[in-house]
């Protein structure tokens, strides 16, 4: 059967807690991606920035989820209206905003 | 030491609103990743959740219940307030309030309560 | 909503016996499952949270166990003071919803 968006969401949001708690080295070698805005498509705009992140086994489980909650394809190099305009963070600082905001929607029922 | 406790009338009309008040000592809801429930429990009965408030003021009801509901913090009096609209006998329960915390995951579990405040609502 | 189902509603144990008592919910709610305490004229207490974890001062006779829809709480020897009615609950998200309770009566 298929999984409650909500549970969905839970899943997401545990996979980037395990990854902000078991980071030892810098994630992904310190990768830097474009930052995006968190306001509205949060799951595209996301899976945007991290998919031109490669060889990094850390966050590939979190780039499937994202797929999972994004309608459109996405592809590396393709980039939306929803990223910040020049500025990139290190991945580590990407996920850690991404799980505060994700956190918040689930708090407030928004799982879609 | 983390206590809660609840005030509320004791005895309501049918019709008329509820408010109940839960003082929080020991912790803060300006804290991140605190919350507060309320849960009521009918005479002889079960236990069900009525709503939740989190540290920055996102709010949850129980469906059933929620266009009768209201809950709202006053963090300066370290205070959550509940009202519940036209009352009815059925609404008659020990109220209880509630502390989450949450951090890292989502837990939503209470782990300490109020002692609890009887409402009866009968005219 | 999620309901949540637990049997036996009442049971009758000896002091010394190891007591189950089962929580059913009508989803995967991925261990997100609390259970609680409540002793007549009182309010409830948090016993165990997420499937397994001991909430700070609960003796260590009470453990909790399950995955998926399925969980139980197990009192492995049984006191006088153990004598309560158990909820359990689920934690995944709002609505929050309880078990019917299970009372536990000394023989």
């Known amino acids: 059967s298929p999984v409650p968006p909500s549970t969905a969401l839970k899943e997401l949001i545990e996979e980037l807690v395990n990854i902000t708690q078991n980071q030892k080295a810098p994630l992904c070698n310190g990768s830097m991606v474009w930052s995006i805005n968190l306001t509205a498509g949060v799951y595209c705009a996301a899976l945007e920035s991290l998919i031109n992140v490669s060889g990094c086994s850390a966050i590939e489980k979190t780039q499937r989820m994202l797929n999972g909650f994004c309608p459109h394809k996405v592809s590396a190099g393709q980039f939306s209206s929803l990223r910040v305009r020049d500025t990139k963070i290190e991945v580590a600082q990407f996920v850690k905003d991404l799980l505060v905001h994700l956190k918040k929607l689930f708090r407030e029922g928004q799982f879609n | 030491e983390v206590t809660l406790r609840e005030s509320g009338p004791g005895l309501v009309k049918p019709t008329q609103t509820l408010t109940l008040t839960c003082t929080l000592y020991g912790f803060s809801l300006s804290t991140s990743d605190m919350g507060v429930d309320w849960i009521r429990q009918p005479p002889g009965k079960g236990l069900e959740w009525l709503a939740h408030?989190?540290?920055?003021?996102?709010?949850r009801y129980n469906p059933a219940l929620k266009s009768r509901l209201t809950i709202s913090k006053d963090t300066s009096k370290n205070q959550v307030v509940l009202k519940l609209t036209s009352v009815d006998p059925v609404d008659t329960a020990t109220y209880y309030c509630?502390?989450?915390?949450?951090?890292?995951?989502?837990?939503?579990?209470?782990?300490?309560w109020g002692q609890g405040t009887l409402v009866t609502v009968s005219s | 909503d999620i309901q949540m189902t637990q049997s036996p509603s009442s049971l009758s144990a000896s002091v010394g016996d190891r007591v189950t008592i089962s929580c059913r919910a009508s989803q995967d709610i991925r261990n997100y499952l609390n259970w609680y305490q409540q002793k007549p004229g009182k309010a409830p207490k948090l016993l165990i949270f997420?499937?397994?974890k001991l909430h700070s001062g609960v003796p260590s006779r009470f453990s909790g166990s399950g995955s998926g829809t399925d969980y139980t709480l197990t009192i492995s020897s049984l006191q006088p003071e153990d004598i309560a009615t158990y909820y359990c609950?689920?934690?995944?998200?709002?609505?929050?919803?309880f078990g019917g309770g299970t009372k536990v009566e000394i023989k």
């Open positions: 509630a502390r989450t915390v949450s951090s890292g995951y989502i837990y939503y579990a209470m782990d300490y």
């Open positions: 997420y499937t397994s």
């Open positions: 609950q689920q934690g995944l998200t709002p609505p929050l919803t």
């Open positions: 408030i989190w540290w920055d003021d996102v709010k």
